[in-house]
């Protein structure tokens, strides 16, 4: 049975998948797929790693952490509800039927978006800037402080310059709510 | 064998810094992560923070950001971890670990840090 | 941060029991979830990792179960020297966090 993960339209999602390498540098191959894990491989592959790289990968799917140490963890830039469904990680260890294969549920929440009569200013309050870095290891929020005053023309543009520099928005912890009045 | 080697007992006054050593011997510190933990007396394990030797990319447990840092010397296989402005809270043993990759597999034998006017 | 909430805190037991110290998470981890012991005086020590793989050198009275939210670490035919703390830790998720602890005691 697969197990159960949550993001929010216009974050990340992060599916975390780990092995412990025989020794380093003995890497063994993974290979991400959308779908439940069939019997071999994965079906419809988003990312694979062989013995030494990353060596197919498709947009907006990257490994949040260090592969190199064992961490296969996925995660998938800016989704959208099509994102939804099961993803397999399968870790490709050697010798007939040996694999470990973990089904991931994938489950899209529409973005919290609520009108309220506030003033415009007050979406600096609601919003800090969020961000994940592309850093090594499992997803970690960290505030960098305040967005200046913004208004309503401006958000696309905010997060269009999130994504396209890699710091990804993620608001998955932060309960943050995006008031515009 | 893997071992991990701590620096010695400090004995430190209050608004001071330290650093503490962890040398290892048996693998590379490249091929891991490692970590550092907290443990006051009687109490649990609180996780402080890891280091990527391979690019000195670090994490952080938010209530030790801005006062725990953690290097790497890849040179001479050893990872430090710096404490500032010291107060009894931080009294405490420190141990440092590596990670392989999400569970701690060997742990240093630990670092007692003793802060005291 | 993930909160992961250890019962009981302490435990006492007669020699030849089995008992179980329960570990919950605040959400999904999946199996990223690690047991140790530390005996008194000592440093911690591996037990179990990914929920239910013994760690090299462990005695097979040890075991884990368990997923997602809900974990089992489970001492069969207690001896003398199993008297410790235990500690359960997941590492889904940084910060990585640990269950407050389970002192065990012999009657």
């Known amino acids: 049975s697969e197990v159960e993960y949550r993001a929010e339209v216009g974050q990340n999602a992060y599916l975390p998948c780990f092995y412990t390498p025989a020794a380093p540098g003995n890497l063994v191959p993974v290979c991400w797929g959308k779908g439940a894990c069939p019997v071999f491989e994965c079906g419809n592959v988003v990312l694979r790693t062989d013995e030494r790289d990353v060596n197919y990968w498709t947009s907006r799917y990257w490994l949040n952490g260090d592969f190199r140490k064992g961490d296969v963890s996925l995660t998938i830039e800016n989704v959208t509800l099509a994102d939804s469904g099961i993803y397999c990680c399968r870790i490709q260890i050697p010798g007939i039927m040996n694999d470990e294969k973990f089904n991931l549920k994938l489950v899209i929440k529409p973005a919290k978006v609520t009108p309220a009569p506030t003033r415009q200013r007050d979406f600096t309050a609601a919003f800090p800037r969020m961000l994940t870095t592309r850093g090594h290891g499992p997803a970690e929020t960290q505030t960098l402080g305040s967005l200046p005053d913004i208004n309503l023309t401006q958000i696309s543009t905010l997060a269009n310059e999130l994504r396209d520099s890699r710091l990804a928005n993620d608001l998955r912890d932060s309960g943050a709510t995006i008031r515009i009045g | 064998e893997v071992h991990l080697q701590q620096s010695g007992a400090e004995f430190m006054k209050p608004g001071a810094s330290v650093k503490l050593s962890c040398t290892a011997s048996g693998f590379n510190i490249k091929g891991h992560y490692m970590h550092w933990v907290k443990q006051r007396t009687e109490q649990g394990l609180e996780w402080i923070g890891r280091i990527d030797p391979d690019d000195g990319a670090t994490k952080f447990a938010p209530k030790f950001q801005g006062k725990a840092t953690i290097t790497a010397d890849t040179s001479s296989n050893t990872v430090y971890l710096q404490l500032s402005s010291l107060t009894s809270e931080d009294t405490a043993v420190y141990y440092c670990t590596r990670s392989n990759p999400y569970y701690f597999d060997y742990w240093g034998q630990g670092t007692t840090l003793t802060v005291s006017s | 941060d993930i909160q992961m909430n250890q019962s009981p805190s302490s435990l006492s037991a007669s020699l030849g029991d089995t008992i179980s110290i329960t570990c919950h998470a605040s959400?999904?981890?999946?199996?990223?979830l690690s047991w140790y012991q530390q005996k008194p005086g000592n440093i911690p020590k591996l037990l179990i990792y990914k929920a239910s793989i013994l760690h090299t050198g462990v005695p097979s009275r040890f075991s884990g179960s368990g997923s997602v939210t809900g974990f089992t670490l489970t001492i069969s035919s207690l001896q003398p020297e199993d008297i410790a703390s235990y500690y359960c830790?997941?590492?889904?998720?940084?910060?990585?966090?640990f269950g407050g602890g389970t002192k065990l005691e012999i009657k």
């Open positions: 830790q997941q590492g889904q998720n940084y910060p990585y966090t």
């Open positions: 959400q999904n981890i999946n199996v990223w």
